[in-house]
Amino acid sequence: EVEKTACPSGKKAREIDESLIFYKKWELEACVDAALLATQMDRVNAIPFTYEQLDVLKHKLDELYPQGYPESVIQHLGYLFLKMSPEDIRKWNVTSLETLKALLEVNKGHEMSPQVATLIDRFVKGRGQLDKDTLDTLTAFYPGYLCSLSPEELSSVPPSSIWAVRPQDLDTCDPRQLDVLYPKARLAFQNMNGSEYFVKIQSFLGGAPTEDLKALSQQNVSMDLATFMKLRTDAVLPLTVAEVQKLLGPHVEGLKAEERHRPVRDWILRQRQDDLDTLGLGLQGGIPNGYLVLDLSMQEALS
């Protein structure tokens, strides 16, 4: 903390301007009025204060606003935002998307910091749900944002917001997250025609159930292998060879290269070898001819 000393004669700041970069920390503390700083925060970002000098300016604002900064100040924090702790940010009430954008801009190009995560959390909680404009903004700055949320948090995403999601935003999502997002996407895109629908829903299919995959297989969608490999194993297993062939279209040949990997490996084990042979791909490991397959799960359900 900077020692309190009297401001030297003639150095009292009348406005926040470039001359202040020549002040030592103790001079900033002594010569810059906190209320002046608060009203001219929009100038701070344009002035190349060192990080040490920014510490002093933050200290002045902390003293002026012990209960947390008003949004008029927060919106213009600029580089000073990098000096805030999650504890500082928890005191804020950020309601404007413009404020959120301004602060995310400062952190642009860096990993999501604890400060940014706290800011987003405060903002989303204040709004009550992750609306489309917010999601648009967050995924523009952090493509992996959606996949950083828990399934519980994702449940507050309204289907209308799904339109803002790009395929790369889902790259790091796990099946539990896609299980939540897929029904929302299905609802959001329900009025689109076949091929357009498939283009939009494709990234979300890691959460699709068997019946939806069966339905897609009737629509000549030509799913690529990368998408197929991300499908839920339990959703793929009940598909017949004919259904998988229709689902993949010309991409069916790619199954050979993936025959040792899930879900292809597990699916092969469930198919009759005769049926697999009809694909002409040399897939091995199916149920030999003449064997009877008992589905014990069905038997248990009936008893």
Epitope: I21, P48, F49, T50, Y51, E52, Q53, L54
Partner: nanobody, 115 residues
């Protein structure tokens, strides 16, 4: 990667002259505002002088009229000409891009002025 190589420090008598040089690489030099910072033993970091991309210069009150900052864009080099040196100018001098905001942190050049 931004690199700044400083030279020209040393020991002089009060009233003498010294010129510091700083050669930059890894960024667009002629678009950048540059500055010289200094830190005396046991004192705070202080900005001594700045030169903006358009060539305009500014100085701390303590060095006005004695120090001159200049740059040679062809050589990617910024200079600090220090005349009428005083013992209180003794410090480690560092050249920085103003956008880096790091002030005196890191390496620098020792200038010692004895009376």
């Amino acid at each position: 990667e931004v690199q700044l190589v400083e030279s020209g420090g040393g020991s002089v008598q009060a009233g003498e002259t010294l010129r510091l040089s700083c050669t930059a690489s890894g960024f667009t030099f002629d678009d950048s505002d540059m500055g010289w910072y200094r830190q005396a033993p046991g004192d705070e970091c202080e900005l001594v002088s700045t030169i903006s991309s358009d060539g305009s210069t500014n100085y701390a009150d303590s060095v006005k009229g004695r120090f001159t900052i200049s740059q040679d864009n062809a050589k990617n080099t910024v200079y600090l000409q220090m005349t009428s040196l005083k013992p209180e100018d003794t410090a480690i001098y560092s050249c920085r891009t103003m956008a880096s905001r790091i002030g005196c942190w890191g390496q620098g050049n020792l200038v010692t002025v004895s009376s």
